[in-house]
Interface confidence: low
């Protein structure tokens, strides 16, 4: 379980000066995002960016270049993977106020002025001030309405139907909102019908179960339409529930399903006393046997830069539910030994998403990765090759004498991904080699000098330069480069005559 993200400044609320800039930093153990008061169209001066830091935490910064009244509101930092549409956002919050002497209330959208109340429930009239110190009163046609006020939310209370106005005074100037319309929703005479299918995907031999429920109505006629209806395959049942309210539950069961039972299952309810009809349907698919489909969102050859964070996402469709595992070079991935994590989440009934996450790519992370999904009827896998892109570096620079002939070969071994290019330079005046202008590129077509290049493997290359005769001490430089970087190394070649003199000495 991840601990909640943290926000800097570490405050519940903050008052920001009009037209000034402000920034909020969020730190989390996984990728974090911001939710903020303005809509996409309005947020041109809100910038969100990720920031590197050495703590190992993910950092996302929200920056506002020029604060306005519309920036007043709740800013929430949350983990990306925890956001679901139906749940309230779980995360860390900070409330920002941007007081504006000309804008007492935070601007709202038109729909915010429609306040729906169900029966005698409490409701919120969402007039929020840009300054927490501004006093506000609520009025309706009869005068001031007593209700509790919170500048972050508005007025909270039990309101009768009708228009309400919020009023505030800022520096002697009076502000009023346009009217908020409170209206109630009562239980209607319309049919309230709900359909439920715990599963919509089956395989041959399984039992299909679909239910339809009618609420707050006792006089209902319900009909089923489904593929096996003609053969009378289905068994229907009715259960009446009276507490806490009236509910009629109709269940259709189709035992020993076959592929031919695939299709639309529809329930149509008619109120016996009125010409009111409601229908719901669900599509059921029955497969001959279980299946697995793997759909990667990346190619079979992927690259990652050294120390980069990278995610590989694979969509899996499967029934029955699959077991999903990851292999590296055909061996099970042991997550606690590496900075590689995997996870699986269920997206829909038969849809799953598996993620392979590289936290900080290393050279040894290169290799063949395989996702394997299996259930009792099928096994599918997908393999991709990962290359960690590494700046070029020289592993070795050595020379090799050809005995009495006086010839010498210099070998330069370099590694990097993409494979580096190797280039040779020489300096003939050994005393001046500290000066860059004394070095010249070694041309391919010079007589008595042969250059060649060989790939040793995917990331290692060996360049050789052979001098037919070395008559005086020279310096040789190997330059290895790829688009991520370059490195050079130098070596002194001593003429054999000089070497023998040194040996004698």
């Amino acid at each position: 379980q991840l601990s909640l993200p943290s926000i800097l400044p570490n405050e519940n609320e903050k008052v920001v000066q009009l037209n000034s800039s402000f920034s909020l930093r969020c730190f989390g153990e996984s990728e974090v995002s911001w939710q903020y008061p303005m809509s996409e169209e309005e947020s041109s001066d809100v910038e969100i960016r990720n920031e590197e830091n050495n703590s190992g935490l993910f950092v996302t910064v929200l920056e506002v270049s020029s604060a306005s009244a519309a920036h007043t509101g709740l800013y929430t930092c949350y983990y990306n993977h925890t956001q679901t549409e139906e749940n309230e956002l779980e995360g860390r919050h900070i409330y920002i106020y941007v007081p504006d002497p000309d804008v007492a209330f935070v601007p709202l959208g038109m729909t915010d002025y429609l306040v729906i109340v169900e029966d005698d429930d409490s409701a919120i009239i969402p007039c929020r001030t840009t300054d927490p110190e501004t006093p506000v009163t609520l009025h309706n046609s009869e005068g001031v309405v007593p209700a509790s006020y919170d500048s972050r939310q508005g007025f909270n209370g039990t309101f009768t139907v009708g228009p309400y106005i919020c009023e505030a005074t800022v520096k002697g100037k009076k502000f009023q909102t346009i009217p908020f319309n409170v209206y109630a929703l009562k239980a209607t005479s319309e049919l309230d019908l709900e359909m439920e299918a715990l599963k919509t995907v089956y395989k041959s031999g399984e039992t299909i179960v679909v239910t339809c429920a009618v609420f707050n109505n006792e006089v209902v006629d319900l009909q089923w339409t489904y593929p096996g209806e003609v053969k009378g395959k289905g068994i229907t049942m009715l259960e009446e529930i009276k507490v806490p309210s009236i509910k009629l539950v109709y269940t259709l069961t189709v035992p020993e399903a076959t592929v031919k039972d695939s299709g639309d299952y529809e329930c149509a309810a008619r109120q016996a006393t009125r010409e009111v009809k409601e229908m719901k349907k669900v599509t059921i698919s029955v497969h001959e046997k279980g299946f697995i489909e793997i759909k990667p969102t990346f190619s079979q050859l992927e690259a990652v830069n050294l120390h980069e964070v990278k995610h590989f996402v694979v969509e899996v469709r499967a029934y029955p539910p699959p077991r999903i595992s990851w292999l590296k070079n055909n061996l099970t991935l042991i997550e606690n030994l590496t900075e590689i994590t995997t996870d699986v989440e269920k997206i829909q009934e038969i849809r799953y998403r598996s993620k392979l996450k590289l936290i900080r790519a290393k050279e040894e992370d290169s290799g063949h990765y395989t996702i394997v999904a299996q259930n009792e009827d099928a096994v599918k896998s997908y393999t991709f090759e990962l290359l960690t892109q590494v700046p070029s570096s020289i592993l070795d620079l050595v020379d090799d004498h050809h005995g009495s002939t006086g010839g010498q070969t210099v070998r330069c071994t370099a590694e990097g991904t993409p494979l580096p290019d190797i280039e040779w330079m020489i300096c003939k005046d050994i005393k001046k080699c500290n000066n860059e202008t004394s070095w010249t590129i070694l041309a391919n077509n010079v007589s008595n000098i042969i250059t060649e290049i060989h790939s040793r493997d995917r990331s290692t290359v060996e360049g050789r330069v052979t001098f037919a005769k070395v008559e005086e001490t020279i310096a040789v430089r190997c330059l290895a480069k790829n688009l991520l970087g370059a490195e050079n190394r130098e070596l002194k070649l001593v003429a054999p005559t000089l070497r023998s003199e040194l040996t004698v000495a």
Epitope: N305, Q389, T417, E423, I441, N444, L483
Partner: antibody, heavy 117, light 107 residues
């Protein structure tokens, strides 16, 4: 066989933004060994490198155009795109997309973009 | 930026003749110099990479040489289909640059 195909409007008004897309077929834009670039050629003139992108999103731009150029990549569509803002008549050219690793080895057939009101 | 200067700007030659185009760089660029051929209304095609390596499918009559700052493209025994503009290009130092081009016409 790798193929690159440029697409986008052939006529752009001065001060507007020129937008072109290059669609790669016969190979993956996500190949780790290659970069993807844009080059242009004004009528009757020579070639000018505009910029380059790697499939991870890393970009390299010609300093003479840097303030106006944005190159982006969409690996899911196997495409990369060029945006050149605040265009003038001097930006009238045939725009080519190409693949390279130091060398531009595969080119699109080019698309003529005219800047005129 | 590195400036590449080609010479000559224009050549008019007869078939079977030998053609030499030179490219001079404003500073040392090693061997990361490449040659392209562009025919009218076509996109450029790679001929020679890294100063002297022929690109696959390029006729053997095209060859390249040089390193450092001076490079040469040689067309041995010119054919009618070789009428085109030839460009050199360096990829050693950003921004990558091209020569101004040499137009070869067949008499």
């Amino acid at each position: 066989q790798l193929q690159l195909q440029e697409s986008g409007p052939g006529l752009v008004k001065p001060s507007e933004t020129l937008s072109l897309t290059c669609t790669v077929s016969g190979g993956s834009i996500s190949s780790s060994n290659y970069y993807w670039g844009w080059i242009r050629q004004p009528p009757g003139k020579g070639l000018e490198w505009i910029g380059t992108i790697y499939y991870t999103g890393s970009t390299y731009y010609n300093p003479s155009l840097k303030s106006r150029v944005t190159i982006s990549v969409d690996t899911s569509k196997n495409q990369f795109s060029l945006k050149l803002s605040s265009v003038t008549a001097a930006d009238t050219a045939v725009y080519y997309c190409a693949r390279h690793h130091w060398v531009f080895d595969y080119w699109g057939q080019g698309t003529l973009v005219t800047v005129s009101s | 930026e590195i400036v590449l200067t080609q010479s000559p700007d224009f050549l008019s030659v007869t078939p079977k003749e030998k053609v030499t185009i030179t490219c001079r760089a404003s500073q040392i660029i090693g061997s990361s110099l490449h040659w392209y051929q562009q025919k009218p209304d076509q996109s450029p095609k790679l001929l020679i990479k890294y100063a002297s390596q022929s690109f696959s499918g390029v006729p053997s009559r095209f060859s390249g040489s040089g390193s450092g700052t001076d490079f040469t493209l040689t067309l041995n025994s010119l054919e009618a289909e070789d009428a085109a503009t030839y460009y050199c290009h360096q990829s050693t130092i950003l921004p990558w640059t091209f020569g101004q081009g040499t137009k070869v016409e067949i008499k």
